[in-house]
């Protein structure tokens, strides 16, 4: 629903777009470091024409928290990186720190990797809407495409045949799945490709029955699909890589006219565009909001999260395009040289995490960071990561795929 005298219709920059309702993925609670969003929560039409300074908005109350440095999140609820597109290339093991209470990918692993999800392949490559000046209409969110890869009727296990290549992790939705690459990469054509990261928050109206905790529900999958379709429309398939859903949280409606029976969620996302894109944080925000406002849909607003804040870094001239190169904020530190995220100093990764095919993760809520092999590898007696035996995959080679 994108019309209403509301509190969030106007972003800190200038922009717009549109789309329908809900869906997500159950994978692993890949709780990426959460960062403060530079959201401006103002009434739909601000009284001033100049953009207000970005502030954090929780939409649920009038309190405006000050941006907190990114921290590692271990809540197992709706913090699930859900990609919403597909396209990327990785190869290097960026050992970023991730946390998770449970992994709901294809096996009940304890840990979680800092990978970025991406659709295994999308059945429905949605062609970008033509913005033909004087011609057809704006991109409208009427077609709900399922950007899934593996299909089945019930909530089966679409990851059982290990469809994800290039050491990416298969993440299960309802009856589809996507492949999760390392942070900053997106999955495309069976490889993880490096892209440009654009973190943000999108507000979406959902059905009253939507439960952000039910990551295997059809509604969650639909949400994922909707967001993917929107972004694919906005950026086009040549530029769009994928969108990862990090968290889904319910809050009060940003529109002043909405009533209590309207359900509205804030979806924290990371959009990964092709490395060659000329888009920057400002143009990305503007394009998305322009699209949202062009027609009537479930999307309410998109707010930018500064990339440097997302990584926990001090601002740089290039807006922290390289998370590995930026300087951590004073109260944070990089858990290890290969982590793009700066975190609270107590969460330091062991030095051994720099080894090949290793990653840093928190296996238990509140636990200390540990080193583990990336999916597709397991530790041998010497502590080195070796490729899984034929027929096995996933974290610690616990996933047996059917031949």
């Amino acid at each position: 629903t994108n019309q209403g005298n509301s509190a969030d219709a106007v972003t800190t920059t200038e922009t717009a777009t549109s789309g329908p309702t809900v869906a997500a993925a159950d994978t692993t609670e890949t709780n990426f470091p959460e960062t403060a969003s530079t959201t401006a929560n103002t009434p739909s039409f601000p009284t001033a024409t100049s953009p207000a300074p970005p502030i954090i908005s929780t939409h649920s109350s009038s309190t405006i928290p000050t941006p907190a440095p990114p921290i590692i999140s271990t809540h197992s609820s709706s913090t699930i990186p859900i990609p919403t597109a597909a396209d990327s290339e990785s190869t290097t093991n960026v050992n970023s720190l991730a946390t998770s209470d449970i992994i709901t990918a294809s096996s009940p692993n304890d840990g979680l990797i800092t990978m970025v999800p991406s659709e295994t392949q999308s059945n429905n490559e949605m062609s970008p809407t033509t913005e033909d000046n004087q011609s057809s209409g704006p991109p409208t969110g009427t077609a709900l495409l399922e950007t899934s890869t593996l299909n089945s009727t019930g909530p089966s296990n679409p990851c059982q045949d290990d469809p994800c290549a290039d050491n990416s992790l298969c993440v299960k939705l309802h009856n589809t799945s996507f492949c999760l690459c390392l942070e900053g990469y997106y999955y495309n054509s069976s490889t993880c490709k490096k892209g440009k990261v654009f973190p943000g928050k999108i507000s979406v109206t959902v059905s009253e029955t939507f439960d952000p905790e039910e990551k295997h529900s059809m509604a969650y999958q639909d949400l994922h699909s909707e967001i993917t379709s929107l972004f694919k429309d906005v950026f086009g398939t040549s530029v769009y890589g994928q969108t990862v859903i990090l968290t889904v949280s319910t809050s009060l409606s940003p529109r002043s006219e909405m009533r209590a029976d309207d359900k509205f969620v804030n979806v924290t996302i990371v959009t990964i565009l092709a490395e060659t894109t000329s888009d920057n944080e400002k143009t990305v925000t503007e394009k998305i909001n322009k699209a949202i406002r062009s027609s009537s849909s479930n999307f309410l607003n998109y707010d930018l999260t500064l990339r440097c804040d997302y990584y926990g870094c001090n601002q740089t001239a290039d807006d922290c395009l390289n998370g590995l190169a930026c300087d951590c904020k004073s109260d944070l530190q990089r858990p290890n040289p290969q982590s793009p995220f700066c975190v609270a100093s107590s969460l330091k990764c062991p030095d051994a995490c720099n080894a090949q095919h290793k990653q840093c993760l928190i296996k238990k809520s509140g636990g200390a960071p540990e080193c583990a092999c990336v999916p597709g590898y397991q530790e041998d007696a010497n502590g080195n990561c070796q490729k899984c035996a034929f027929g096995y995959s996933g974290l610690d080679c616990k996933d047996k795929f059917q031949l």
Partner: antibody
Framework: QVQLQQSGAELVRPGSSVKISCKAS????????MNWVKQRPGQGLEWIGQ????????YYNGNFKGKATLTADKSSSTAYMQLSSLTSEDSAVYFC???????WGQGTTLTVSS | QIVLTQSPTIMSASPGEKVTMTCSAS?????IHWYQQKSGTSPKRWIY???KLASGVPARFGGSGSGTSYSLTINSMETEDAATYYC?????????FGSGTKLEIK
């Protein structure tokens, strides 16, 4: 508060052109699509098209292609609609509107008569 | 394009009476929006996103529906409700309006 102030009534000759204006205030003009709607006397509403002032992007109802041209001036927060080759069929009240938040101008009455 | 058919075209109701008017879309739309227009004035947004009342709209009004079938209801007609009501979709381009339902007071 938000206001959309339209230009005054016009009486023009058939075959000529006219440019109607809609001055916006109270919101970020360049970030919301401006729509134009036609209403003939005693008739219903008909969508003409929309313009995104931020970059000038436009979409038209096919029935109005070649008839209406939408433009916007960000510096003055004003949207314009030019109607060309006017006939008596173009006699109507024309509204500018921001559908997103439900704001409408007061309407401009256009009379085409010889 | 999506055609919106409103019915009835004209109706009258006595004060206190319940009023229902419908809007049928030729194909499915995400949301329907309703406008109230009185003679010589611009349309006012009345109900948006199918069921949300615009600012200042009395609680006796309601909207519902999904897909291709939508309706506007007044629980208890009042004199000031006499007007023409238009439904609109702007989910799909070109955006379209219904032909209107004229509501008169008996």
């Amino acid at each position: 508060q938000v206001q959309l102030q339209q230009s005054g009534a016009e009486l023009v000759r058939p075959g000529s052109s006219v440019k109607i204006s809609c001055k916006a205030s109270g919101y970020a003009f360049s970030t919301y699509w401006m729509n134009w709607v036609k209403q003939r006397p005693g008739q219903g509403l008909e969508w003409i098209g929309q313009i995104y002032p931020g970059d000038g992007d436009t979409y038209y109802n096919g029935n109005f292609k070649g008839k209406a041209t939408l433009t916007a001036d960000k510096s003055s927060s004003t949207a314009y609609m030019q109607l060309s080759s006017l006939t008596s069929e173009d006699s109507a009240v024309y509204f500018c509107a921001v559908f997103w938040d439900g704001y409408w101008g007061q309407g401009t009455t256009l009379t085409v008569s010889s | 394009q999506i055609v919106l058919t409103q019915s009835p075209t004209i109706m009258s109701a006595s004060p206190g009476e319940k009023v229902t008017m419908t809007c049928s879309a030729s194909s499915s739309v995400t949301y329907i929006h309703w406008y109230q227009q009185k003679s010589g004035t611009s349309p006012k947004r009345w109900i948006y996103d199918t069921s949300k009342l615009a600012s200042g709209v009395p609680a006796r009004f309601g909207g519902s529906g999904s897909g291709t079938s939508y309706s506007l209801t007044i629980n208890s007609m009042e004199t000031e409700d006499a007007a023409t009501y238009y439904c609109q979709q702007w989910s799909s381009n070109p955006f379209t309006f219904g032909s209107g339902t004229k509501l008169e007071i008996k």
